[in-house]
């Protein structure tokens, strides 16, 4: 560690005095301290002399000697007071800049240690400090305002009592800067804009930050626009707003608009697209297939996407039949706005009943006219089956009628014994009817098919079963010949109620 001569922690001299401070170390040594006038430095190998032959109050301060080659970075210091009766303070700075919550050192150095008892910190023009200002004083360093706040950005003076009167220092401006968390916050409204040629439009780009030092600009297709800036301060934030007003838009105004703001922390940008159209438009679409099939008893949501400008003047869902004149309940219709020009309309159809199959139309209107989008809803049903015994052209025939949607397939089974349903062990014969006769097939209704099984002789200890199935389910009917005629059996489990 270097050694300073004189070997005292502090030295008090009068103005005009000669001061010689010598520092000796193992290697080369360097003096440092507050930049001030009249000092001469002289180095001689492992010693360095700092001297003045005309000390002034401005030489008051702490002078440190270091040994640059010392890996431990040892240093020695001496504090010099130049005791000027006319100048109790040596102020090392005109301005002090700190971040919020840092300690702010106001470097008023007392030129006479005897005056320490009567020092105080005030705001300029003798105004008292703000409430909750927590500060301390060191005659070597000055006043420290602890955990400085933005609101404490003021002009301060150091005061000392000399002969019963207060002597003020020159003022020090304290600037407490907000800690900037990142680039300015941005808003660009609207997020999307559509206008018909000739209409007026407004785009507003605004940025805000806790610190006033930031820039904001609006650019159109990478060209910076010259727009007057409005500035404001509220909610402890600085705001800068750029407003682009277009009285009559044309196609050259269309395109990408970017709002860009930057500060020392970096840059933020956000963009929007401005579309200029020749006339009003209204487009309806759906991500769903317009032809829908749903099993009876289940639910369905019909969704329509609407793109429109100007906004919709009216819209509704309509049931077009064929079953009844009922209309969808308004509470089942729901509208959500995706953004200014795009909306989604949903019709909820829970627990569908047979009478609710048919066409549903969504109609919308704006100044561009009417548009409609129609869904066709067909209900799926599991087959219902019935079998009768009859004579056709003199031949005994089992006639099976199956009704359902989609169109059922028909299979005949002959099995031994009397049973409600043939099982594998009992089956004697199986006939598939690949082409049953379609008796009825109207839109939105069940399809009814008929299958004939010609039986020369009914075997009395046997069962004839007609089975029908489709993608929804299956149904069957067992026919049991008895001596007194024929007996038919629908299976116990077939008790379907939609």
């Amino acid at each position: 560690i270097p050694v300073i001569e004189p070997s005292v922690p502090e030295l008090v001299v009068k103005p005009g005095a000669t001061v010689t401070l010598r520092c000796v170390g193992n290697g080369s040594v360097e003096w440092d301290g507050p930049p001030s006038p009249h000092w001469t430095l002289y180095s001689d190998g492992s010693s360095s002399i700092l001297s003045t032959n005309n000390a002034t109050f401005q030489n008051t301060g702490t002078y440190r000697c270091t040994e640059p080659g010392d890996p431990l970075g040892g240093s020695a210091a001496i504090h010099l007071y130049v005791k000027d009766p006319a100048r109790p303070w040596n102020v090392l700075a005109q301005e002090v800049v700190v971040f919020e919550d840092q300690d702010a050192l106001l470097p008023c150095l007392l030129t006479d240690p005897v005056l320490e008892a009567g020092v105080s910190l005030v705001r300029v023009r003798g105004r008292p400090l703000m409430r909750h200002t927590n500060y301390s004083f060191s005659p070597w360093h000055g006043f420290t305002i602890h955990r400085a706040k933005f609101i404490q950005s003021q002009d301060y003076q150091c005061s000392a009592l000399m002969g019963g009167r207060k002597v003020m220092s020159i003022s020090i401006r304290l600037k407490v800067q907000k800690v900037i968390p990142g680039p300015p916050a941005l808003t660009l409204v609207p997020a999307e804009l559509v206008r018909i040629r000739g209409e007026a439009a407004q785009i507003v780009c605004s940025a805000s930050s806790v610190d006033v030092n930031f820039d904001v600009f609006l650019q159109h297709n990478n060209t910076k626009l010259a727009i007057p800036q409005q500035s404001d301060f509220h909610n402890n934030r600085y705001q800068k707003v750029l407003t682009l007003n277009l009285d009559q838009v044309d196609f050259q105004h269309a395109g990408n608009y970017s709002c860009v703001a930057s500060n020392v922390q970096g840059k933020h940008s956000t963009s929007m697209f401005f579309r200029v159209v020749e006339s009003a438009y209204l487009n309806l679409s759906s991500e769903q297939n317009l032809i829908q099939e749903v099993t009876v008893g289940e639910g369905l949501n019909l969704k329509v996407m609407v793109e429109a400008y100007p906004g919709l003047q009216g819209f509704n869902w309509t049931y077009l039949g064929p079953f009844s004149d009922h209309q969808p309940e308004p509470k089942l219709a729901n509208a959500t706005t995706k953004d200014t020009y795009r909306h989604t309309f949903t019709l909820s159809l829970p627990r569908l009943k047979p009478s609710e199959a048919g066409r549903y139309s969504f109609l919308a209107r704006n100044p561009g006219g009417w548009r409609a989008l129609t869904f066709e809803l067909t209900l799926r049903y599991p087959p219902e089956v019935s079998v009768i015994w009859t004579f056709i052209n003199g031949s005994g025939t089992l006639l099976c009628a199956a009704s359902g949607y989609p169109q059922p397939n028909v299979t005949w089974l002959q099995c031994s014994g009397h049973t409600d349903r043939c099982d594998e062990a009992q089956v004697l014969q199986v006939w598939d009817d690949p082409y049953p006769e379609v008796l009825s097939q109207e839109p939105f209704h069940k399809v009814t098919v008929q299958s004939l099984l010609t039986v020369e002789t009914l075997e009395h200890n046997q069962t004839y079963e007609c089975r029908a199935h489709n993608s929804v389910g299956s149904g069957s009917w067992a026919f049991i010949p008895i001596s007194a005629g024929a007996h038919t059996h629908p299976p116990d489990e077939f008790l379907f109620t939609p």
Partner: antibody
Amino acid sequence: QVQLQESGPGLVKPSETLSLTCTVSGGSISSYYWSWIRQPAGKGLEWIGRIYTSGYTNYNPSLKSRVSMSVDTSKNQFSLKLSSVTAADTAVYYCARERLGAFFDYWGQGTLVTVSS
Amino acid sequence: QSVLTQPPSASGTPGQRVTISCSGSSSNIGSNTVNWYQQLPGTAPKLLIYSNNQRPSGVPDRFSGSKSGTSASLAISGLQSEDEADYSCAAWDDSLNGPVFGGGTKLTVL
């Protein structure tokens, strides 16, 4: 070996604010005075101001109304802001370490700032 | 207009001794020490002399400084081609409360 590096935009529009940062490497920024100095083309050097690591500053009186400096010891950086610039502020800007005796022992390589629309 | 006055140019032949002057006032050179900087073309200034006549380590003893009253001078003996540069003087100014510089002298080695 202490090294200084200036950074910031090379072109600033008239009336806007010039912002430069000096990053110190190879040594600590603490307990030293750091200055900004500029040199217009073909002219002499001009001291702009200094900042100590505690945040206290002194500015050249001719520029005082437009200058602001700050220091960030955590990043080993100090910065300069010069507002309301004109073409007369076009210069090479240097950052430097100032020592007792008003001499500058370490300098950045300098950055040319042009003020033009 | 620089506060300290220097001749705009100086020249010498290799091996020669050249002197560059710097003149100020009582508020700067008259009451404070003088520092000298060398600026090679396209580079930053480099400290050459501090506190009137002190050389930082690495500066050849061909360079020397002196001060008298409100003037100072830099002497370069045994001039070499690599000495071709701009040389600026500087001093603390009491009224500025900071350093002031000369306008620089362009030294040409002929």
